[in-house]
């Protein structure tokens, strides 16, 4: 299916409204320091050129790939080497190694302003007074933050910024109508990011095999009534379109994405009962819903997996004349019995039976060896039963705040080189594990969890990997896509760190104190008990917690205080004396 | 793909010798266990023998035990089978398999034990 020029045909595929979103979102994403308004720039005269070759596919310039054409258009800038560094030396490279040298300057942490939300008639005048930049704007932001975020999906997001703009501005009570959709979208939209991180980097550092299996283990989840044949066709499309949109081919990506949701719509007797009503819905949000439908119903009468996988004189057989394909089999027929199950234990699941079958096909007598293979399973599905079950009923004794401080001592103990603000970042994450999975029945608990720590712990990885400071973490992290969670559970208390030197000024506060929202005053309060557990790692959680406790009141006090700065002058010190004492 | 292409059979009289062949391809020969399997006319697959990936575990039917030998070559990708003392009750077609599979995949070859 080759095209005479590829623009054209992406051109022609998205319309202009989407390839314009999609090359805002491409080079927000490559050049995330460059102001909105230069992308904007590059924008229209891409934009424009597609236009010329979609009137004369022989223009000039107009053959040549997409790479080339944006890749050539991001060298322009004329400040790249002051803003971006040696990100300007992949301009001197030939493609492909000028987008594979783009691509490694993708920046996980850029240091960019957190986003403030000004006054809601701000927002709503800008928007009534020019919709196209208000959206624009919407997609610049959050691209240059995420980039690494699904663009088909945050072309999805900004309908919805958009929709939300609509109505709400008309609204009696703007704020009222509006805010709660925004922060729904501002939730969303960062779990959206990190679970798509989680999908490039599975298949940056672990390979399309890798993420196949994943996809294998999800769609069978899904779509438990659907032929293997047909599952493993649904996730090699899957994986074209995500190794496309990791790679930054956001056109390709965007336009394969459409196909693969209009061939599921037109093939749902054979996928899934679930997919009616996704399927009446305009593009964006069929593909959205498409991605999140929930689990069909398991077929009723499914025999056991014993009979082919573990009975069957032909194991070693079938596994010889195709290794992949069999573990493949294996893999779905295992995962749509098991809804109840996470995606990366269904994986480690395989891979136990596969390292079974390495073993024993090399057997005189591979039968007596593997036999007993579904009983090597129940540690394994045992483990994170029990890691969920009790940190549900922490959860549930203590509350999201003191569970995410539970954790944050738990995680600073297991890797305390890791910088402050990263600990505090992905504890807090980690901790909102049980508002979000704790509530929901049994069945649905350890897919919620594991699942969502998966990505979780990805954040924790690739932060880590841009400055590593810990051999602990870069294990976990490198040996085992699959094995990650558990690597990290495992982990003790860090005997070799040398605790760090205490500083009075970490644990010096002001006024500013009081003037912060909640969840910055929680941040504040958790910075600085990271910061007490690197100076005292063996501390007890009893020790902390009066700290901790002491804390609080301390701040309180002087937030109530008629001279707020001078409390702070005056108790902090005492304070810090006091929780050196305690912790002594 | 996996091919096993079997060789040697024939045509042997009572108390005589044979060395079947069987040459493989498609898999990792190296890293799988293998069998030879026989089908007597009328009767349904009877396990012979079987061995290791590396040669040195072997087992056998009782019926073989003593006159059959199972071997490997690893490095020519051959499986062996070392017929001594034959009698009229080993007329099958003979043929190897990955494993202790009894599933037929390939022609197998014919022998026949008769004075």
């Known amino acids: 299916d080759t095209h005479k020029s590829e623009v054209a045909h992406r051109f022609k595929d998205l319309g202009e409204e989407h390839f314009k979103g999609l090359v805002l979102v491409a080079f927000s994403q490559y050049l995330q320091q460059c102001p909105f308004e230069e992308h904007v720039k590059l924008v229209n005269e891409v934009t424009e050129f597609a236009k010329t070759c979609v009137a004369d596919e022989s223009a000039e310039n107009c053959d040549k790939s997409l790479h080339t054409l944006f890749g050539d258009k991001l060298c322009t800038v004329a400040t790249l080497r002051e803003t971006y560094g040696e990100m300007a030396d992949c301009c001197a490279k030939q493609e492909p190694e000028r987008n594979e040298c783009f691509l490694q300057h993708k920046d996980d942490n850029p240091n960019l302003p957190p986003l403030v939300r000004p006054e809601v008639d701000v927002m709503c005048t800008a928007f009534h007074d020019n919709e196209a930049t208000f959206l624009k704007k919407y997609l610049y932001e959050v691209a240059r933050r995420h980039p690494y975020f699904y663009a088909p999906e945050l072309l999805f997001f900004a309908a919805r910024y958009k929709a939300a703009f609509a109505e709400c501005c008309q609204a009696a009570d703007k704020a009222a109508c509006l805010l709660p959709k925004l922060d729904e979208l501002r939730d969303e939209g960062k779990a959206s990011s990190a679970k798509q991180r989680l999908k490039c980097a599975s298949l940056q550092k672990f390979g399309d095999r890798a993420f196949k299996a994943w996809a294998v283990a999800r769609l069978s989840q899904k779509f438990p009534k659907a032929e293997f044949a047909e599952v493993s066709k649904l996730v090699t499309d899957l994986t074209k379109v995500h190794t496309e949109c990791c790679h930054g081919d956001l056109l390709e990506c965007a336009d394969d994405r459409a196909d693969l949701a209009k061939y599921m719509c037109e093939n749902q007797d054979s996928i899934s009962s679930k997919l009616k009503e996704c399927c009446d819905k305009p593009l964006l949000e069929k593909s959205h819903c498409l991605a999140e439908v929930e689990n069909d119903e398991m077929p009723a009468d499914l025999p056991s997996l014993a009979a082919d996988y573990v009975e069957s004189k032909d194991v070693c057989k079938n596994y010889a004349e195709a290794k992949d394909v069999f573990l493949g089999m294996f893999l779905y027929e295992y995962a749509r019995r098991h809804p109840d199950y996470s995606v990366m234990l269904l994986l480690r699941l395989a891979k136990a039976y596969e390292a079974t079958l390495e073993k024993c096909c090399a057997a005189a007598d591979p039968h007596e060896c593997y036999a007993k293979v579904f009983d090597e399973f129940q540690p394994l599905v045992e483990e994170p039963q029990n890691l969920v079950k009790q940190n549900c009923e922490l959860f549930e004794q203590l509350g999201e705040y003191k569970f995410q401080n539970a954790l944050l001592v738990r995680y600073t103990k297991k890797v305390p080189q890791v910088s402050t603000p990263t600990l505090v970042e992905v504890s807090r994450n980690l901790g909102k594990v049980g508002a979000k999975c704790c509530k929901l029945p049994e069945a649905k608990r350890m897919p919620c969890a594991e699942d969502y720590l998966s990505v979780v712990l990805n954040r924790l990885c690739v932060l880590h990997e841009k400055t590593p400071v810990s051999e602990k973490v870069t294990k976990c992290c490198t040996e085992s896509l699959v094995n990650r969670r558990p690597c990290f559970s495992a982990l003790e208390l860090d005997e070799a760190y040398v605790p760090k030197a205490f500083n009075a000024e970490t644990f010096t506060f002001h006024a500013d104190m009081c003037t912060l929202s909640e969840k910055e005053k929680q941040v504040k309060k958790q910075t600085a008990l990271v910061e007490l557990v690197k100076h005292k790692p063996k501390a007890t959680k009893e020790q902390l917690k009066g700290v901790m406790d002491n804390f609080a009141a301390f701040v309180e006090k002087c937030c109530k205080a008629d001279d707020k700065e001078a409390c702070f002058a005056e108790e902090g010190p005492k304070f810090v004396a006091a929780s050196q004492a305690a912790l002594a | 793909q996996v091919q096993l292409q079997e060789s040697g059979g024939g045509l042997v009289q009572p108390g005589g010798s044979l060395t079947l062949s069987c040459a493989a391809s498609?898999?990792?020969?190296?890293?799988?266990?293998m069998s030879w399997v026989r089908q007597a006319p009328g009767k349904g697959p009877e396990w012979v023998s079987a061995i290791d990936s590396s040669g040195a575990d072997t087992r056998y039917a009782d019926s073989v035990k003593g006159r059959f030998t199972i071997s490997r070559d690893n490095a020519k990708k051959t499986l062996y089978l070392q017929m001594n003392s034959l009698k009229p009750e080993d007329t099958a077609v003979y043929y190897c398999t990955i494993g202790r599979s009894t599933s037929r995949g390939s022609q197998g070859t014919q022998v026949t034990v008769s004075s």
């Open positions: 498609g898999f990792t020969f190296g890293s799988f266990g």
